[in-house]
Interface confidence: medium
């Protein structure tokens, strides 16, 4: 999937962007609001009646190298007893980020975006039953 | 990929950190995207904590929309259908990467961007403070 | 996408145990909730269990329960079913089948299935 290019007349002036090869982007890595934090309510993931773990991912070779996904812990939803009903479903809640992937390739290195699909948390749904005739 | 040379030595030489400016293919690597719509749409309906989804636009951007939740309600639907206050409704938000254009409106530079996006809802057993 | 195999089917006596296997293909694997069914010769296919992505959450058919055991192992993308005193009556084409969703999978719509692999109960 290629990078959209908005109508040209939105442009600056070429001169006035920095050149760049055919078929490639220039990608400053530096990251503008890294510092950012998310400020969910405490706990959630245990508190919610669709719970879930989290596993982080390492790749040396993603930037960023890790990346957190969740996992419903149960395929019902916790009842106000406690209890695991079926009757409703625990399903995952994603979302895509991009990610910039380094290749070898013999004593070279190249680039490369990637989308990841990022499962967030989950949450608790009426199931879609079919009637099978 | 756009391939770049290393150093003479390069077996020697792996370099653990990813350099601060990269040249990367235009085309985006998107193996990993699975999502179904028509899977996972109806989630924001079908939840016992659902929410809207509002469309955010930005040029400057890729992706240029991205979708935000806002959760309908402060408690979570029962069992009737109801309202049920001793629960909450939160968001679940996610710190995502984007590209951001920069220097602005050139085609092919940009630069990596972190933001907060709330993706969906979830209920909650509420915090109850007892106050002495 | 997820690819489905199943293997470990086979010829058992009356009584006796098998393991069905079912490797998947896919990064995501720990991500779907995966399951087993069955289709007798004639009948329409039946719901043996399913298994939650971190493996905390099994359900089972209820008629099959005590009998069969269904765990999985994140690390090796692998799905197991060990089936215990079996009866001519469990002779089926077993297939392992995967979705993000146990609603659907619990009703037989899901998004991924194996091609199955056939058990065949006789003495």
């Known amino acids: 999937r290629k990078i959209p290019k908005v109508g040209h007349t939105f442009f600056q002036k070429p001169e006035s962007c920095p050149p760049v090869p055919g078929g490639s982007m220039k990608l400053d890595i530096g990251i503008i609001n890294e510092n950012q934090r998310v400020s969910m309510s405490r706990n959630i993931e245990s508190r919610s009646t669709s719970p879930w773990n989290y596993t982080v991912t390492w790749d040396p070779n993603r930037y960023p190298s890790e990346v957190v996904q969740a996992q419903c812990r149960n395929l019902g939803c916790i009842n106000a007893q406690g209890k695991e009903d079926i009757s409703m479903n625990s399903v995952p809640i994603q979302q895509e980020t991009l990610v910039v992937r380094r290749k070898h390739q013999g004593c070279s290195v190249s680039f490369q975006l990637e989308k990841v699909l990022v499962t967030v948390g989950c949450t608790c749904v009426t199931p879609v039953i079919h009637h099978v005739q | 990929g756009i391939t770049i040379p290393r150093n003479p030595g390069c077996p020697n030489s792996e370099d653990k950190n990813f350099p601060r400016t990269v040249m990367v293919n235009l085309n985006i690597h998107n193996r990993n995207t699975n999502t179904n719509p028509k899977r996972s749409s109806d989630y924001y309906n079908r939840s016992t904590s659902p929410w809207n989804l509002h469309r955010n636009e930005d040029p400057e951007r890729y992706p240029s929309v991205i979708w935000e939740a806002k959760c309908r309600h402060l408690g979570c639907i029962n069992a009737d259908g109801n309202v049920d206050y001793h629960m909450n409704s939160v968001p679940i938000q996610q710190e995502i990467l984007v590209l951001r254009r920069e220097p602005p409106h050139c085609p092919n530079s940009f630069r990596l961007e972190k933001i907060l996006v709330s993706v969906g809802c979830t209920c909650v057993t509420p915090i109850v403070h007892h106050v002495a | 996408d997820v690819q489905l195999v199943e293997s470990g089917g086979g010829l058992v006596q009356p009584g006796g145990s098998l393991r069905l296997s079912c490797a998947a293909s896919?990064?995501?694997?720990?991500?779907?909730?995966v399951g087993w069914f069955r289709q007798a010769p004639g009948k329409e296919r039946e719901f043996i269990g399913a298994i939650s992505g971190s493996g905390e959450s099994i359900y089972y058919a209820v008629s099959e329960k005590g009998r069969f055991t269904i765990s999985r192992d994140n690390s090796k993308n692998t799905l197991y079913l060990q089936m215990n005193s079996l009866r001519p009556e469990d002779t089926a084409v077993y297939y392992c089948?995967?979705?993000?969703?146990?609603?659907?999978?619990?009703?037989?719509?899901?998004?991924?299935w194996g091609q199955g692999t056939l058990v065949t109960v006789s003495s």
């Open positions: 896919g990064r995501t694997f720990s991500s779907y909730v």
């Open positions: 089948t995967a979705d993000q969703e146990f609603g659907y999978l619990r009703f037989g719509r899901s998004e991924y």
